[in-house]
């Protein structure tokens, strides 16, 4: 029997200080570049080595960025999202959604003494 894959979704506020070479990550997504089907959100596609985001350590590839300095990233063109980051200033506050994959055991089978349930 196959296990099912669930996702644990958490949100986090990440405050980054722009480094000498910027914030140090790449993004995909936008209304004109849907990365996830039926979702025009903005996602992190790359964390640059030794960049501000990498040194902070909290932002991860695959994270969805919900807002920048309180500004919602919904329904933005890709380039408009890029420009928003580039013009965000020295101290940048990101509201981020992490999506962690959780592998559950086979459905309907619980070992004896399993405390859950």
């Amino acid at each position: 029997m196959n296990g099912r894959v669930d996702y644990l979704v958490t949100e986090e506020e990440i405050n980054l200080t722009r480094g000498p070479s910027g914030l140090g990550f790449n993004i995909v997504g936008g209304t004109d570049q849907q990365y996830v089907s039926n979702d025009s959100g903005i996602y992190v596609s790359r964390i640059k080595e030794n960049g501000a985001a990498a040194l902070d350590g909290r932002l991860q590839e695959g994270d969805k960025i919900l807002s920048v300095n309180g500004q919602d990233l919904k329904n933005l063109l890709h380039q408009d999202a890029v420009d928003l980051f580039r013009n965000a200033g020295y101290a940048v506050s990101l509201r981020v959604q992490h999506r962690l994959q959780v592998q559950n055991g086979p459905i309907g089978h619980r070992g004896e003494g399993d405390p859950s349930g």
């Epitope: 910027g22 914030l23 790449n26 995909v28 990365y35 790359r46 640059k48 890029v82």
Partner: nanobody, 126 residues
Framework: QVQLVESGGGLVQAGGSLRLSCAAS????????LGWFRQAPGKEREFVAA???????YYADSVKGRFTISRDNAKNTVYLQMNSLKPEDTAVYYC?????????????????????WGQGTQVTVS
């Protein structure tokens, strides 16, 4: 993991043309930023051209007006059309890619902007 495979290199006379192709794996090819670099024997790797997801293009001064970079998202392929070739264009040509757009100032000629590299294809202009 993105894989890049270059083809189309060869031996050509000065003044001639070649078209290089770089086939990429991955279902999100349309989001890739792609570049061409070259390396001649005994020299450092040199930027040639780059293309963004929206087909914005960048060229090294040495190839401007002679080379054209383009992409076909339906075929997961990026091309480098090289016209009016010169002996100094002789090098191994490499395709490079990164997923997405940097939120920082984009420097297309910086190899650190790219995560994935092909094995290269030899171009010799006699």
């Amino acid at each position: 993991q993105v894989q890049l495979v270059e083809s189309g290199g060869g031996l050509v006379q000065a003044g001639g043309s070649l078209r290089l192709s770089c086939a990429a794996s991955g279902r999100t090819f349309s989001t890739y930023t792609l570049g061409w670099f070259r390396q001649a024997p005994g020299k450092e790797r040199e930027f040639v051209a780059a293309i963004t997801w929206s087909s914005g293009t960048y060229y090294a001064d040495s190839v401007k007006g002679r080379f054209t970079i383009s992409r076909d998202n339906a075929k997961n392929t990026v091309y480098l059309q090289m016209n009016s070739l010169k002996p100094e264009d002789t090098a191994v040509y490499y395709c490079a890619a990164v997923i997405g757009s940097t939120v920082d100032t984009y420097n297309p000629g910086d190899p650190l902007e790219y995560d994935y590299w092909g094995q290269g294809t030899q171009v010799t202009v006699s």
